[in-house]
């Protein structure tokens, strides 16, 4: 004999000894009907704020307050936003690798230094993790470009940076 709990909709719970679909109490939810209990809704407090409020069928979703970003599945923790010279990865804030920079506070990804030689210019000031290179005026007589080979710890993929 089919249990009538099987016909219960999400947002309800049902006990086998009394197979009646009952609505989830306040601050609880069930995304699958026919379960013996409803789940307690997640509360977004402290460094968290509500991204989506709880309903009888769906749990609440949290996001981090201004100045912080989510880490972990379903935003399980909040970490302070990245500083210039860093970019966000799953592990958190990671220093820009050699040949890349990020001058933004809290957002953005590490991007490659400008290749001055593309415009026939020399490097006036070397780049850092926080600042792009500064290109000088156009070079009149071109010297052959040299390739700096970046070690695997360097920029994405241990690639090469062209400088004059």
């Amino acid at each position: 004999v089919q249990n009538s709990c099987d016909n219960c909709q999400p947002g309800t719970f049902c006990r086998k000894y009394n197979p009646v679909c009952k609505s989830c109490p306040p601050s609880t939810f069930s995304s699958i009907g026919g379960q013996p209990n409803c789940n307690i809704c997640r509360v977004c407090a402290g460094y968290f704020r509500f991204k989506k409020f709880c309903s009888s069928t769906h749990n609440a979703e949290c996001e981090c307050i201004e100045g912080f970003h989510c880490l972990g599945p379903q935003c399980t923790r909040c970490e302070k936003d990245c500083r210039p010279g860093q970019e966000l990865t799953k592990q958190g804030c990671k220093t820009c690798s050699l040949g890349t920079f990020n001058d933004q506070n809290g957002t953005g990804v590490c991007r490659p230094w400008t290749n001055c030689s593309l415009d026939g210019r020399s490097v006036l000031k070397t780049g850092t993790t926080e600042k792009d290179v500064v290109c000088g005026p156009p070079v009149v007589s071109f010297s052959p470009s040299t390739t700096i080979s970046v070690t695997p710890e360097g920029g994405p993929g241990g690639h090469s940076l062209q400088v004059l």
Partner: antibody
Framework: EVQLVQSGAEVKKPGSSVKVSCKAS????????IYWVRQAPGQGLEWIGN????????FYGEKFMGRATFTADTSTSTAYMELSSLRSEDTAVYYC??????????????WGQGTLVTVSS | NVMLTQPHSVSESPGKTVTISCKLN????????VHWYQQRPGSSPTTMIY?????PDGVPDRFSGSIDSSSNSASLTISGLKTEDEADYYC??????????FGGGTKLTVLG
């Protein structure tokens, strides 16, 4: 609506070069990485390299260094990939893809339709 | 070299659940995000799961992603299989130099 539209199919002779274009629209072209990925017939996806169109900075996969060249024309929001010294193993569909600026290890949210490059004598 | 290994092919009947694994050979699967793409014949890849377990708008909730640090692998699970799910699926992550790495791809066949 974000779109990446690539140039048409090419047939090339071994030893020659090919230049594939990827025209971006619907977003600020200079603020997102463009990645180049290829797929040989019946094979998986292979990363070639990427470019930051904002300043033309490039990264190349070890396998393609010295043979691939990426450029970007910000006036037309178009990225280009040139592959030289072509050989039969370079026969593949070449894709451009955009990476969001959320994190350094993010996904590719938009892909071009692909450009088939056939290398045959 | 960092490698992501996927089964070459999996098959299951409509309505059933299938899981595609993506195993990292070195390093920690939890260190960098894992993403999943679906590719139908003659089409470009499209994102099914991004940042380990997130679904883009328009992707049905039959698709879910997870990370298992004990087996150092990621998984894509498709429940209530439909014939339209038949495609190649690729996992994608990064190595320590933020170089993209792709799995070899898994061909999903929906039987019947």
């Amino acid at each position: 609506e974000v779109q990446l539209v690539q140039s048409g199919a090419e047939v090339k002779k071994p030893g020659s070069s090919v230049k594939v274009s990827c025209k971006a629209s619907g977003y600020t072209f200079t603020s997102y990485y463009i990645y180049w990925v290829r797929q040989a017939p019946g094979q998986g996806l292979e990363w070639i390299g990427n470019i930051w169109p904002g300043n033309g900075g490039t990264f190349y996969g070890e396998k393609f260094m010295g043979r691939a060249t990426f450029t970007a024309d910000t006036s037309t929001s178009t990225a280009y990939m040139e592959l030289s010294s072509l050989r039969s193993e370079d026969t593949a569909v070449y894709y451009c893809a955009r990476r969001p600026d959320y994190s350094g290890d993010d996904y590719f949210d938009y892909w071009g339709q692909g450009t088939l490059v056939t290398v045959s004598s | 070299n960092v490698m992501l290994t996927q089964p070459h092919s999996v098959s299951e009947s409509p309505g059933k659940t299938v899981t595609i694994s993506c195993k990292l050979n070195s390093g920690n699967i939890g260190s960098y995000y894992v993403h999943w793409y679906q590719q139908r014949p003659g089409s470009s890849p499209t994102t099914m799961i991004y940042r380990d377990d997130k679904r883009p708008d328009g992707v049905p909730d039959r698709f879910s992603g997870s990370i298992d640090s004990s087996s150092n692998s990621a998984s894509l699970t498709i429940s209530g299989l439909k014939t339209e799910d038949e495609a190649d699926y690729y996992c994608h992550s990064y190595d320590s130099t933020i170089t993209p790495v792709f799995g070899g791809g898994t061909k999903l066949t929906v039987l019947g």
